[in-house]
């Protein structure tokens, strides 16, 4: 004969577990049901009722199969210097990352608490590492034979032209000026530009603050909680 | 409005039976989730939960006295009775009724009534 | 069946002043724990569910914090109201009350 079918609640077998998407209630010392996700447990079960659930509220949410008796709260509004990548729902929180030029300073479990801007190289300083979502850029000195005239966050030290009588010797923030109507160069002529940070939602590593920088605003990081987790909720 | 009242006899002589009445206002024990639950406290001291009884007929009890209690309840006339066996002096406590939430904290309480056990 | 330590059973403290008390559990009761006041010859009044929801009408100078068997009620700057005897309680498995600590003014 086949196994009966038990419907919850219900004793588990001794030594085994609950099925998926049940939990055992070590008050009841049952088998019940879980929420799906986007609700919330309402009533816990008892040895001959089982949970009862009911649909998260307005900005709370719950992501997975669970037995919380409340929802979860959505994150705060984006801010000024994010854009929301993923909008708060009962089934899922809102998630805020960082606009374009911006990089996240302080990440959370999903998205960005604290975005910075991206620092800017000087003139007579290039990029060395690009910005990404998650760190910012870091800049070097211009080495002898190419510079910077510009203060960016995407321009690397680009060659000196090459003179046939050179007027003007080029450093570090400066290109060579020639005398010659036909100057040459070891590259092709123009600024060369990194691509801006592509999304990725890598972990934030620090950068390291690099002296040769244009002066950049110091941020206070708030260090308060993440956004409670789900209590065991796992299937 | 929610309320909670105890009633029942302020001294009881040792192993003597406890009968302690709790009737109460504002929510029915028929409404899924609904509770209601005794806890006592000796003079000066922690509170000790006892038992309590849900919508559904469902009972639990501290292990420790479970031997000693039973707890029913009158749906029609909102009451729950707790009896409590073979009392003893250092059962001398406040007994107060509770009511219980869906998600099992107590957030109603009674006044609560004084019994004492002496011969 | 779990056992609730909380600690300390008594403390002074002045107006304004920042109270903490913790509550330890044996095993892991999850989120669940309400704390409760309770002044002479009253009933517990509660006053925080599931760790950290505040009852409505309760000052948010109360708050909780902890998951798991590690659990903190704070009064972030006392007032002579909050003089009385605080509880915790856990319900994630049975019901267990902690022993108590008595709040009083310098």
């Known amino acids: 004969l086949p196994a009966q079918v038990a419907f919850t609640p219900y004793a588990p077998e001794p030594g085994s577990t609950c099925r998926l998407r049940e939990y055992y209630d070590q008050t009841a010392q049952m088998c019940c049901s879980k929420c799906s996700p986007g609700q919330h447990a309402k009533v816990f079960c008892t040895k001959t009722s089982d949970t009862v659930c009911d649909s998260c509220e307005d900005s709370t949410y719950t992501q997975l199969w669970n037995w919380v008796p409340e929802c979860l709260s959505c994150g705060s509004r984006c801010s000024s210097d994010q854009v929301e990548t993923q909008a708060c729902t009962r089934e899922q929180n809102r998630i805020c990352t960082c606009r374009p030029g911006w990089y996240c300073a302080l990440s959370k479990q999903e998205g960005c608490r604290l975005c910075a801007p991206l620092r800017k190289c000087r003139p007579g300083f290039g990029v060395a590492r690009p910005g990404t979502e998650t760190s910012d850029v870091v800049c070097k000195p211009c080495a002898p034979g190419t510079f910077s005239n510009t203060t960016s966050s995407t321009d690397i030290c680009r060659p000196h032209q090459i003179c046939n009588v050179v007027a003007i010797p080029g450093n570090a923030s400066m290109d060579a000026v020639c005398t010659s109507t036909s100057p040459t160069r070891s590259m092709a002529p123009g600024a060369v530009h990194l691509p801006q940070p592509v999304s990725t939602r890598s972990q934030h590593t620090q950068p390291t603050p690099e002296p040769s920088t244009a002066p950049s605003t110091s941020f206070l990081l708030p260090m308060g909680p993440s956004p409670p987790a789900e209590g065991s909720t796992g299937d | 409005q929610v309320t909670l009242k105890e009633s029942g006899p302020a001294l009881v002589k040792p192993t003597q039976t406890l009968t302690l009445t709790c009737t109460f206002s504002?929510?029915?024990?028929?409404?899924?989730?609904?509770?209601v639950g005794w806890i006592r406290q000796p003079p000066g001291k922690a509170l000790e939960w006892l038992a309590h009884i849900w919508w559904d007929d469902d009972k639990f009890y501290n292990p420790s006295l479970k031997s000693r209690l039973t707890i029913s309840k009158d749906t029609s006339k909102n009451q729950v009775v707790l009896t409590m066996t073979n009392m003893d002096p250092v059962d001398t406590a406040t007994y107060y009724c509770?009511?219980?939430?869906?998600?099992?904290?107590?957030?109603?309480w009674g006044q609560g009534t004084t019994v004492t056990v002496s011969s | 069946d779990v056992q609730m330590t909380q600690s300390p059973s008594s403390l002074s403290a002045s107006v304004g002043d920042r109270v903490t008390i913790t509550c330890k559990a044996s095993q892991d009761i999850n989120k669940f724990i309400a704390w409760y006041q309770q002044k002479p010859g009253k009933a517990p009044k509660l006053l925080i569910h599931y760790t950290s929801t505040l009852q409505p009408g309760i000052p948010s100078r109360f708050s909780g914090s902890g998951s798991g068997t590690d659990f903190t009620f704070t009064i972030s700057s006392l007032q002579p109201e909050d003089i009385a005897t605080y509880y915790c309680l856990q319900y994630g498995n049975l019901w267990t009350f902690g022993g108590g600590t008595k709040v009083e003014i310098k």
């Open positions: 509770a009511r219980l939430t869906g998600t099992r904290y107590f957030d109603y």
């Open positions: 504002g929510f029915s024990l028929s409404t899924s989730g609904m509770g």
